[in-house]
């Protein structure tokens, strides 16, 4: 069964900066990735970035840099300073639309006890959506 993994890490070199990494474990091809925070996309979450393999990448503050790492994984760097900055227990979600598997989503957050430079354990908690 396809799964999505999510990692969240506070960078040791920039304590106000978060890196979110997400990946798709299915064998299909990714047609769209949506990264949100505060909950799943469409269920109270706020979109941070949308990555399309052909049409490019759109991102919204406090997202600083979104990129395709590989064909099946992405990363997003968030600026942590300012009113819209994430806190340690913020939930980040990644939704992958793939062919032929459909849409899969998982969420993760940085544990409050995490040391800078350490990442949250990956949280493959797929939600099959019949989009």
């Amino acid at each position: 069964t396809p799964e999505v993994w999510v990692q969240v890490r506070m960078e040791a070199t920039e304590l106000s900066s978060f890196t979110i990494r997400c990946g798709f474990l299915g064998s299909g091809s990714i047609s769209l990735v949506t990264v949100s925070w505060g909950g799943p996309n469409g269920a109270g979450g706020t979109t941070l970035a949308v990555l399309h393999p052909e049409r490019g990448i759109r991102q919204w503050a406090p997202a600083r840099q979104a990129r395709w790492e590989t064909q099946s994984s992405i990363s997003l760097i968030l600026e942590g300073s300012g009113a819209s900055s994430p806190c340690a227990n913020t939930t980040f979600c990644c939704k992958f639309a793939s062919f032929p598997e459909g849409s899969w989503e998982a969420c993760g957050s940085l544990p409050p006890s995490s040391d800078p430079g350490l990442s949250a354990p990956p949280t493959p908690a797929p939600i099959l959506r019949a989009d």
Epitope: Q7, T70, Q71
Partner: antibody, heavy 123, light 108 residues
Framework: QIQLVQSGPELKKPGETVKISCKAS????????MSWVKQAPGKGLKWMGW????????TYADDFEGRFAFSLETSVSTAYLQINNLKNEDTATYFC????????????????WGTGTTVTVSS | DIVLTQSPAIMSASPGEKVSMTCSAS???SSWYLHWYQQKSGASPK???????NLASGVPARFSGSGSGTSYSLTISSVEAEDAATYYC?????????FGSGTKLEIK
């Protein structure tokens, strides 16, 4: 077994064009990106960029913008590198290399390498 | 551009010796994005260590990788003759994705 088999050596003159092939086998071609790496004689490795084998979108390193083009023929699981207007400094071995899928332990590693194609540019 | 400086450029070791080589980055690289490759003379490179410390398939357990930030290393606990090769580090932290200049390991 997973393999990337590249086309044979090429001897070209300055100003000519070369097209190198990289045929993949043993895995689903469109699931992994394909990278290209240059190695000049006696020198180190230089990342040229990669192509998304599903969308066909290419990303080039700055030094390889312009004269270099990645392309695909997915029906035969083959990636191509074309170099236009060849220069003497293009003399090198060119490797295709599969861009690993990425995991919780890392990303951006090249987990399978091609056999290499030597291109010699000389007048 | 992130410049990766490998040292030493060339090193020589006897079988059974412990050796370490370093890869120093001009700016910080996340451990997720630091990898090592082995290339023997006349052959294609092979992925050796990925994500700083994970051994690629088939790599002997005498190899290990460690580091963070701007300083990374590859260690061989007990060198064998078959380890003679050039080892390259590579970063995928920021574009352009660069390789180090390599450390050539010779066996006495």
């Amino acid at each position: 077994q997973i393999q990337l088999v590249q086309s044979g050596p090429e001897l070209k003159k300055p100003g000519e064009t070369v097209k190198i092939s990289c045929k993949a086998s043993g895995y689903t071609f469109t699931t992994y990106g394909m990278s290209w790496v240059k190695q000049a004689p006696g020198k180190g490795l230089k990342w040229m960029g990669w192509i998304n084998t599903y969308s066909g979108v290419s990303t080039y390193a700055d030094d390889f913008e312009g004269r270099f083009a990645f392309s695909l023929e997915t029906s035969v699981s083959t990636a191509y590198l074309q170099i236009n207007n060849l220069k003497n400094e293009d003399t090198a071995t060119y490797f295709c290399a599969r861009l690993g899928r990425g995991s919780t332990t890392g990303a951006g590693y090249l987990d399978v390498w091609g056999t290499g194609t030597t291109v010699t540019v000389s007048s | 551009d992130i410049v990766l400086t490998q040292s030493p450029a060339i090193m020589s070791a006897s079988p059974g010796e412990k050796v370490s080589m370093t890869c120093s980055a001009s700016s910080s690289v996340s451990s997720w994005y630091l990898h090592w490759y082995q290339q023997k003379s006349g052959a294609s490179p092979k992925l050796w260590i990925y994500g700083t410390s994970n051994l690629a398939s088939g790599v002997p357990a005498r190899f290990s990788g460690s580091g963070s930030g701007t300083s990374y290393s590859l260690t061989i606990s007990s060198v064998e003759a078959e380890d003679a090769a050039t080892y390259y580090c590579q970063q995928y932290h920021s574009d352009p994705y660069t390789f180090g200049s390599g450390t050539k390991l010779e066996i006495k």
